[in-house]
């Protein structure tokens, strides 16, 4: 309810009649409440007869005039108590007070909601002097009111170190509903309930809310703001908005899209970033996420060799960074690679498969059955071996690398020999007599040098020894190579 300024018990006519420049607005004052249709001019309630001071905050001057008559208490006159008007309208209101002429330099300040209004406000103070008193009228005008102008306005005047304060003038700016909470876009699970919230405020209140789904009203009768719409579930995307109505009319919120979560689309553009003999680095562009964040991805790898058993290797990885290094692959092999990613709803289909090849690698095993013996007549050491298994060559054999280390008292000398891939024997000349020769052999491909075989040692005696048995790599399971003399 609108409360009006109080009537006073002890009238004291300081300034009879209405003042020049009294209350004005840009529209006719009315004394009826606004009806539901809204669009009314401002309402003004002025409960007083002109010329009655209030007893609110009164300064009682101690000064007396020449005739020694005590001066009356000073107080602002009553004015309009509550102004209701529509946004963008203009309004002017005032405070008035009659001050004995003995007071000099009186100034009136305007305050809103406890803060002094300074600067670019349209405040004008007019003085109307008479023989004994000066009528002061302070007017405040707002050319186009906004909601932020809502509030309680008062005048203050300082006299004799006393502060005189007027009754408040309440300005209520009414307009269309203003949304304080609008529905927000969401991604929801199919056929699962969810809530949307809409809140709008006046003044004027009440504000009533209608919900709209895909251009159709959800509720034909409104709900008071704030309103929560519980949607029992959707099977397809929908757009929701809300309408807010009050006595000034209606406003419409933004429309928000509610998406249904689905399995993701398959990744696209799977590409090979880098290949080695035993690994392939791939990247991919994720497909549409189905309105639900990706959780992880699965890389599927099949041997492309038609003779392979068609088994699929699966490597799981995080969804980011759309990059994965596939390891433990065979060298010089062809693979088909596909990528699939999942969200909370499920797995996408597999991306288009791409072909990728590993490069040639260094052999993964050493030559087998290395045998070493001394041919004294030619002063050579003969070495024999068996090729590593083809599968483990990891490429096309281009030759072998032989390491032979000669050790005698105080001397150690390592020499490397490269031999071609044809055959499986080699001959090296004796470097030092009365020494131990340690031989190791590695297979070589264009991919590099493979592991060296276990060392085989042979003792090369001083000149004149007769019989030498060959040395060889041990049979599997033996811990150390054995030198046979």
């Amino acid at each position: 309810a609108i409360t009006e300024a109080r009537e006073e018990a002890k009238p004291y006519p300081l300034f009879p009649g209405p003042f020049p420049g009294s209350l004005q607005t840009d529209h006719t004052p009315l004394l009826s409440l606004p009806h539901a249709s809204g669009y009314q001019p401002a309402l003004m309630f002025s409960p007083t007869q002109p010329g009655r001071p209030h007893t609110g905050n009164v300064a009682i001057p101690q000064v007396t005039s020449v005739e020694s008559k005590p001066l009356p208490p000073l107080a602002f006159k009553h004015t309009v108590g509550h102004i209701i008007l529509s946004e963008h309208k203009g309004v002017k209101f005032n405070c008035s007070i009659s001050v004995p002429n003995i007071y000099q330099d009186t100034t009136i300040s305007w305050w809103k909601d406890g803060k002094e209004l300074l600067g670019a406000h349209h405040a004008i103070t007019q003085f109307y002097p008479d023989d004994e008193v000066t009528a002061i009228i302070a007017s405040f005008s707002i050319t186009s009111v906004q909601r932020s102008d809502n509030g309680s306005y008062i005048c203050k005047m300082k006299i004799n170190n006393e502060e005189i304060v007027s009754d408040p003038i309440y300005i209520e700016v009414q307009g269309l509903p203003h949304f304080t909470k609008q529905p927000e876009s969401m991604n929801v699970t199919r056929n699962t309930a969810f809530n949307l919230t809409c809140q709008a405020v006046g003044p004027p209140e009440p504000v009533n809310i209608f919900w709209v789904q895909n251009s159709s009203r959800v509720n034909e009768q409104p709900e008071k703001s704030p309103s929560v719409l519980t949607v029992p579930g959707l099977t397809e995307m929908a757009v929701f908005s809300c309408e807010a109505h009050n006595d000034k009319g209606l406003t419409v919120s933004k429309g928000v899209q509610i998406n249904i979560k689905a399995i993701p689309s398959p990744p696209t553009e799977v590409s090979i970033r880098n290949s080695t003999a035993h690994s392939i680095l791939i990247s991919w562009v994720p497909g549409f996420d189905g309105y639900s964040p990706f959780r992880n991805c699965s890389i599927q790898v099949k041997e492309a060799d038609p003779l392979s058993n068609g088994s699929v290797m699966i490597f799981n990885t995080s969804a980011l960074p759309h990059l994965y290094q596939i390891k433990q692959l065979q060298a010089l092999a062809n693979y088909s690679i596909g990528v699939s990613c999942m969200n909370e709803i499920g797995w996408s289909a597999v991306s288009p498969w791409i072909l990728a090849s590993t490069t040639e690698g260094a052999p993964s095993v050493a030559p087998l059955n290395v045998t070493v013996f001394l041919n004294e007549s030619s002063d050579n050491v003969d070495i024999r071996w068996m090729k590593p298994p083809t599968k483990q060559q990891d490429g096309e054999l281009v030759g072998y690398r032989i390491s032979h280390v000669w050790q005698s008292a105080g001397i150690s000398k390592e020499l490397l020999e490269e031999v071609g891939q044809n055959g499986s024997r080699a001959r090296i000349s004796v470097q030092v007599h009365n020494a131990t020769c340690t031989v190791r052999i590695a297979a070589v491909t264009r991919g590099g040098v493979g592991p060296f075989s276990d060392p085989v040692k042979i003792f090369i005696p001083a000149h004149g020894w007769v019989d030498y048995a060959p040395s060889s790599t041990p049979a599997p399971g033996n811990a150390d190579p054995v030198l046979i003399i």
């Epitope: 009806h35 539901a36 249709s37 809204g38 669009y39 269309l176 004027p204 209140e205 009440p206 009533n208 209608f210 709209v212 251009s215 159709s216 009203r217 034909e220 009768q221 409104p222 008071k224 908005s241 309408e243 109505h245 009050n246 006595d247 000034k248 009319g249 209606l250 406003t251 419409v252």
Partner: antibody, heavy 121, light 112 residues
Framework: QVQLVQSGSELKKPGASVKVSCKAS????????MSWVRQAPGQGLEWMGW????????TYADDFKGRFVFSLDTSVSTAYLQISSLKAEDTAVYYC??????????????WGQGTTVTVSS | DVVMTQSPLSLPVTLGQPASISCKSS???????????LNWLQQRPGQSPRRLMY???KLDSGVPDRFSGSGSGTDFTLKISRVEAEDVGVYYC?????????FGGGTKVEIK
Amino acid sequence: QVQLVQSGSELKKPGASVKVSCKASGNTFTTYGMSWVRQAPGQGLEWMGWINNYSGVSTYADDFKGRFVFSLDTSVSTAYLQISSLKAEDTAVYYCARDYYGSGGWVFDYWGQGTTVTVSS
Amino acid sequence: DVVMTQSPLSLPVTLGQPASISCKSSQSLLDSEGKTYLNWLQQRPGQSPRRLMYLVSKLDSGVPDRFSGSGSGTDFTLKISRVEAEDVGVYYCWQGTHFPRTFGGGTKVEIK
């Protein structure tokens, strides 16, 4: 002052279509809605439905779903009622009325002068 | 739909005398917020309808206070304390509590 001015009388043959206009002035058109009300000769009033002048969202009473369409041209502050496949029983005066939901409920506060639609072969 | 029944259909009155129109609804018009959205329209001869009263008893601006409304639930009354010549026309009650909005059949007020 809000004013709603409707288009003139129409005489149509059964099966034809008619489009009645309602031009608003004196207020911001998109801050309210427009209801349409039918008054058949010698009969009472029937509420046909309403359209939100901002969003164009329409609501129709059950008896007026299908052949009746509300539309807007906000650039000229005008609401329209189109009736297709006219029948003799569509003969009536059609009123537009400004509408929204205030503290006193649905408002219906300003009415057009009415458009008479006569359907006769 | 809510059926609104007005009586009498026709109401001949003497100028300066009171008049009373009854409106009954097939369902209560009291909504969950405690408001009753029962309204009255006046349609003078050859004119458009005009809003007269809302929320049972609140007069629209510019409506003379010789008009008054009362009632609750399903039974409502429009009274004119002293009928004047300008009051001649058809009066309709209508409800906005339930969807769709529905009107009474109208009561024709004429001077005897």
